[in-house]
Interface confidence: low
């Protein structure tokens, strides 16, 4: 029997385009999460080590990467916008962290002990100095 | 919501660390859009959010479109939405 | 809030069987994992199996062969079917449930399963 395997995360960041900042003067960040089963995510931004909720938009659900399957993997995106100013700040530190509550076959993937199977996925920019 | 100055446009963004995925960002555009999702399997596109920037009192609405393909362009990605042509702003080379 | 609720533990002799139940109430709906884990004296908790919404099944080592995880979605209950019993599977058993929703991760009180002759 072909037994379902589960799927962690990967999670990516993207930095702001330099044509929105000098458009917009914001400056959007974007996270994905991508290739992940079953969809159990929870997706959180931090910046300067504390996690932040304004400027924040989150897809509601996790999308299915290849909707026809039943058992599609998932991707999850969520922005993050931010002053121009705030993002050319290099001491400003941003991270996504996506919290995937999975079940993997030994428990390796755990930093959390108090939680076996919980799995925390992080991936992360720094302000940019202009230059 | 309402959003006060509508301003569609289409930024290409790029990751932090080497990866294959291109990631397109459509922003700033106007409630009554609708974003389509793509026809093309290897492409995704995000239903639209709604982002409220509080310390500034801003909200805007955006569409997150990302591929893994080499051909993947910003320009092609949200073509069963309709937007308009001036929204597309291409990525200058970074000179960092 | 979901709320689990483990039966069947007791003692049995080496060889023997026992079904453990694990009844979900409140937000049963948005679950969609459930496992069963054990706890030996001594030890750290392990997975023994696990179950989808899919009833796709996936076991520990230790299990396969032996032990069986199922659903019952109309009583939402869900079921570990252990057979040929070993000493070295005398733990206290919990069962446990993951759900889309906050915050995400249910455990039970755990049952008792002691293997001795």
């Known amino acids: 029997e072909d037994l379902k395997k589960v799927f962690p995360p990967k999670v990516a960041v993207f930095e702001p385009s330099e044509a929105e900042i000098s458009h917009t003067q914001k400056a959007t960040l974007v996270c994905l999460a991508t290739g992940f089963y079953p969809d159990h995510v929870e997706l959180s931004w931090w910046v300067n080590g504390k996690e932040v909720h304004s400027g924040v938009s989150t897809d509601p659900q996790p999308l299915k990467e290849q909707p026809a399957l039943e058992d599609s993997r998932y991707s999850l995106s969520s922005r993050l916008r931010v002053s121009a100013t705030f993002w050319h700040n290099p001491r400003n530190h941003f991270r996504c962290q996506v919290q995937f509550y999975g079940l993997s076959e030994d428990d390796e993937w755990t930093e959390d002990r108090d939680k076996p199977i919980t799995q925390k996925i992080s991936a992360e920019a720094w302000g940019r100095a202009d230059c | 919501p309402y959003i006060q100055n509508p301003d569609p446009a289409v930024y290409q963004l790029r990751g932090s660390k080497s990866n294959d995925t291109s990631v397109c960002l459509f922003t700033d555009f106007d409630s009554v859009m609708n974003v389509s999702q793509s026809k093309d399997s290897d492409v995704h596109i995000t239903d639209k959010t709604v982002l409220d920037m509080r310390s500034m009192d801003f909200k805007s609405n955006g569409a997150v479109a990302w591929s893994n393909k080499s051909d993947f362009a910003c320009t092609s990605a949200f073509k069963d939405s309709v937007i308009p042509a001036d929204t597309f702003f291409p990525s200058p080379e970074s000179s960092c | 809030e979901v709320q689990l609720v483990e039966s069947g533990g007791g003692v049995v002799q080496p060889g023997g069987s026992l079904r453990l139940s694990c009844v979900a109430s409140?937000?049963?709906?948005?679950?969609?994992?459930y496992g069963w884990y054990r706890q030996a004296p001594g030890k750290e908790r392990e997975k023994v199996a696990h179950?989808?919404?899919?009833?796709?099944?996936d076991y520990a080592d230790s299990a396969k062969g032996r032990f069986t995880i199922s659903r019952d979605e109309s009583k939402n209950t869900v079921y570990l079917q252990m057979n040929s019993l070993r000493p070295e599977d005398t733990a206290l058993y919990y069962c446990?449930?993951?759900?889309?929703?906050?915050?995400?991760?249910?455990w039970g009180q755990g049952t008792l399963v002691t293997v001795s002759s």
């Open positions: 446990r449930a993951l759900s889309r929703i906050w915050p995400y991760d249910y």
């Open positions: 179950i989808s919404i899919g009833d796709q099944t």
């Open positions: 409140w937000d049963v709906h948005q679950i969609n994992f």
